[in-house]
Amino acid sequence: SGTTNTVAAYNLTWKSTNFKTILEWEPKPINQVYTVQISTKSGDWKSKCFYTADTECDLTDEIVKDVKQTYLARVFSYPAGHVESTGSTEEPPYENSPEFTPYLETNLGQPTIQSFEQVGTKVNVTVQDEWTLVRRNDTFLSLRDVFGKDLIYTLYYWKSSSSGKKTAKTNTNEFLIDVDKGENYCFSVQAVIPSRRTANRKSTDSPVECMGHEKGESRE
């Protein structure tokens, strides 16, 4: 038969950061290829990554159409060299993915401190607003555009000369903090969606930036 000796995919896993979303699976193919289909709960199946020998498929273009929908994917296995034939009635082996809701489940990418500026005993720290591949009206949206006030940032800051950390929070991309005059400080930020109750609630910490280096500016 047309699908003999093909193995169903397994370990289907969603890998998603800032809505860039890839479905991965096993096994590495031996004499077989894969086609992926994706659908919302109420929608039709759409085929992607036709007859690929890869074990991953970039589904970003589909999920960014509505990041609040819940998606399901499935991976079909075909014999290598398979050509679609209209007469074939036998369904190839396939495996379903877990459900995936991008808005709730995409990981937050590592943030970047865009700049910091000191004026007297105040420092304004700005976090870069990352662009995503989510679109509305042919415009790409930033992370802040998508999440609005659901997204907060936590700032960790400390004197270069000590290890005691302080924290501040903002629901924008800017912090205004008090510092001691004449002291240099170091900064790191983390993106957080407080309403999430899962492991993907927080991003990794940004790279550390310290005063006295090129990102900063000081004015008396």
């Epitope: 509505d66 609040k68 607003d129 509305r136 009206n137 949206l141 609005g148 006030k149 659901d150």
Partner: antibody, heavy 120, light 111 residues
Amino acid sequence: KQSVEESEGGLFKPTDTLTLTCTVSGFSLSYYGVSWVRQAPGNGLEWIGTIDSSGRTYYASWANGRFTISNDNAPNTVSLQVNSLAAADTATYFCARDFYGWNSGALDIWGPGTLVTVSS
Amino acid sequence: ELDLTQTASPVSAAVGGTVTINCQASQSVYSNKYLSWYQQKPGQPPKLLIYKASTLASGVPSRFSGSGFGTEFTLTISDVQCDDAATYYCAAAYSDDSDTAFGGGTKVVVE
């Protein structure tokens, strides 16, 4: 085509309760927010409140308590209820789609508006 | 109380000329840039022109442009047309969850 439309207003008496519905088509309320805005005759625009794409509601400080926005009646409708109507509530009421889905102030699709008159 | 103060009405503009309308917020708007501009003609609903301070809404002519950051914002109409006669409103979101506000409106008269 994406659109929003308010139900018909009309003439109401002081202390009456007003319920307006906003029917949306061509887009999902799970992805876009809806705001209610009113405009008294000859006056400017006044934001009443917003229901975001997660179903959370936000109100202007002056509207809190007497105004209620909800979307639990039907999948494509958002309701505005106003209790204890007064003459000062006489206005054209608009519903509009929030472009970002949260309470952003960017309202990209508006209904034609419906006139509500409160008079004894 | 949140306040958006706009250029006083009316503002006169000549066909082919340029008009600017200012909008000043009593505190920084949300993330310094979530401010929108609307055009409203009598008997019609408002129309979104600009969002996020400077992004042109779909279908709006490029004669309209927006700028600003924090508390000070400007709508500029260049090569003014007769059809631009209308009242223009700014609107903003604020960091406080519950707050969105409209400015008082600026009427533009085209001569």
